[in-house]
């Protein structure tokens, strides 16, 4: 039950996170005009990954796309790439995790297969979240650098008496959405990985081996322990056979998730 809850919660958290990453990537307010300590302008400038916008005091908003690819800063291209990779990985992760959910039965899918899929989706969510956090952080770092550079040159002389005011940009809403969404996706991924450990059967599936013990014959059946929700001792588990014969298989240590292919 706890495994199903953990897996389900991980899926939901990741779903919200990936939706947030998509929203952040599409948002126009990655950087917004800094209004503090600036001349009061009758326009408000803000920029996204794909276009820049200007809202005039009348409420009229005009946006222009970045129609060039080669002319854009390498950092912006890198941020775009990170966000897209994050979305793609997250989307694939969501697809995989749907089939991995314990509450959904698909044919005669083994628990081990579900465990593998849960682990795979969990790793994808973690990488997706990290991509989003990295992308947003790179953009934020770019903003901070440019902010202080433009503060240093706040008023640059133009032909003696004429001055030009440099527009400074600060963090936009999309950055906070991206950080939170990336964090949620990361947490969701970790939860999926934790759920994977509980989903994994407690023993490797060896072929049934028949052997004879002195006195009477016993067939050793695989799955001597029923799958438990975690690792470590489980006093509730009962052996499903009784016999004096023992094999090396019986006394082996509990399998780890790496035992499953």
């Amino acid at each position: 039950m706890a495994v199903t809850a953990c897996q389900g919660l991980g899926f939901v958290v990741s779903l919200i996170g990936i939706a947030g990453i998509i929203a952040a990537t599409c948002m126009d307010q990655w950087s917004t005009q800094d209004l503090y300590n600036n001349p009061v302008t009758a326009v408000f400038n803000y920029q996204g990954l794909w276009r820049s916008c200007v809202r005039e005091s009348s409420g009229f908003t005009e946006c222009r796309g970045y129609f060039t690819l080669l002319g854009l800063p390498a950092m912006l291209q890198a941020v775009r790439a990170l966000m897209i990779v994050g979305i793609v990985l997250g989307a694939i992760g969501l697809l995989v995790s749907i089939f991995a959910l314990k509450c959904i039965r698909i044919g005669s899918m083994e628990d081990s297969a579900k465990a593998n899929m849960t682990l795979t989706s969990g790793i994808m969510f973690i990488v997706s979240g990290l991509c989003a956090i990295a992308g947003v952080s790179v953009f934020a770092n770019m903003l901070v650098t440019n902010f202080w550079m433009s503060t240093a040159n706040m008023y640059t002389g133009m032909g003696g008496m004429v001055q030009t005011v440099q527009t400074r940009y600060t963090f936009g809403a999309a950055l906070f959405v991206g950080w939170v969404a990336g964090g949620l996706t990361l947490i969701g991924g970790v939860m999926m990985c934790i759920a994977c450990r509980g989903l994994a059967p407690e023993e490797t599936n060896y072929k049934a081996v028949s052997y004879h013990a002195s006195g009477h014959s016993v067939a050793y059946k695989p799955g001597g322990f029923k799958a438990s929700t975690g690792f470590g001792s489980n006093t509730k588990n009962k052996k499903i056979y009784d016999g004096g014969a023992r094999t090396e298989d019986e006394v082996q240590s509990y399998p780890s998730k790496h035992d499953y292919v």
């Epitope: 009061v40 326009v43 200007v54 030009t164």
Partner: antibody, heavy 120, light 113 residues
């Protein structure tokens, strides 16, 4: 047809108060920012104040802050300018003007103006 | 505050001739966000309110004759009346539309020679 009609001007003594009104018609008043601009006799234009469609933000020319108050009533399609502690230099024709949409913040329609004379 | 300086103060031009009015701002009126200039030109005839002619430094307001041409960028702007007509006798004002307080130039009086 867009129409802006100012009223409330007249002769007032220095230190007195006056409230100007601007009645708007022919457009959706609640969707537009509005300005007050004044022009002293024989002089140039001087921007006074701006109020956005939702009454915030509001801007004033620095020298009139504290004495003049701009407000609007979207239900009545009206713009107001409350002028207190009036001085002789406030004598001018006061125009209300609409902040045009998609015209780079320009003032696209103006009223005929109302004359305010501050004199003892 | 942005200071708008218009020149000349007055201008006498023959009918059909070109009239040129200059306007200089103390700070650039080019908004980097959209690469647009926030400068407007107004025409005021005696006893009338101002009328918007040009916005965004070069875009004519609807209904304005094409003999009125706005040009310039940054801090230097020009209003040109390519062929002066009798009805163009008026005072012309430029206005900063980028920074509050919005400021006007002192005006240029255009007359017929």
């Amino acid at each position: 047809e867009v129409q802006l009609v100012e009223s409330g001007g007249g002769l007032v003594q220095p230190g007195g108060s006056l409230r100007l009104s601007c009645a708007a018609s022919g457009f959706t008043f609640s969707s537009f920012g509005m300005h007050w601009v004044r022009q002293a006799p024989g002089k140039g234009l001087e921007w006074v104040s701006y109020i956005s469609s939702g009454s915030s933000p509001i801007y004033y020319v620095d020298k009139l802050k504290g004495r003049f108050t701009i407000s609007r009533d979207n239900a009545k399609n009206s713009l107001y300018l409350q002028m207190n502690s009036l001085r002789a230099e406030d004598t001018a024709v006061y125009y209300c003007a609409r902040a045009g949409y998609a015209v780079r913040n320009a003032l696209d329609y103006w009223g005929q103006g109302t004359l305010v004379t501050v004199s003892s | 505050d942005i200071v708008m300086t218009q020149s000349p103060d007055s201008l006498a031009v023959s009918l059909g001739e070109r009239a040129t009015i200059n306007c200089k701002s103390s700070q650039s009126l080019l908004n980097v966000g959209n690469q647009k200039n926030y400068l407007a030109w107004y025409q005021q005839k005696p006893g009338q309110p101002p009328k918007l002619l040009i916005y965004g430094a070069s875009t004519r307001e609807s209904g304005v004759p094409d003999r009125f041409i706005g040009s310039g960028s940054g801090t230097d702007f020009t209003l040109t009346i390519s062929s002066l007509q009798a009805e163009d006798v008026a005072v012309y004002f430029c206005q900063n539309d980028l920074f509050y307080p919005l400021t006007f130039g002192g005006g240029t009086k255009v007359e017929i020679k």
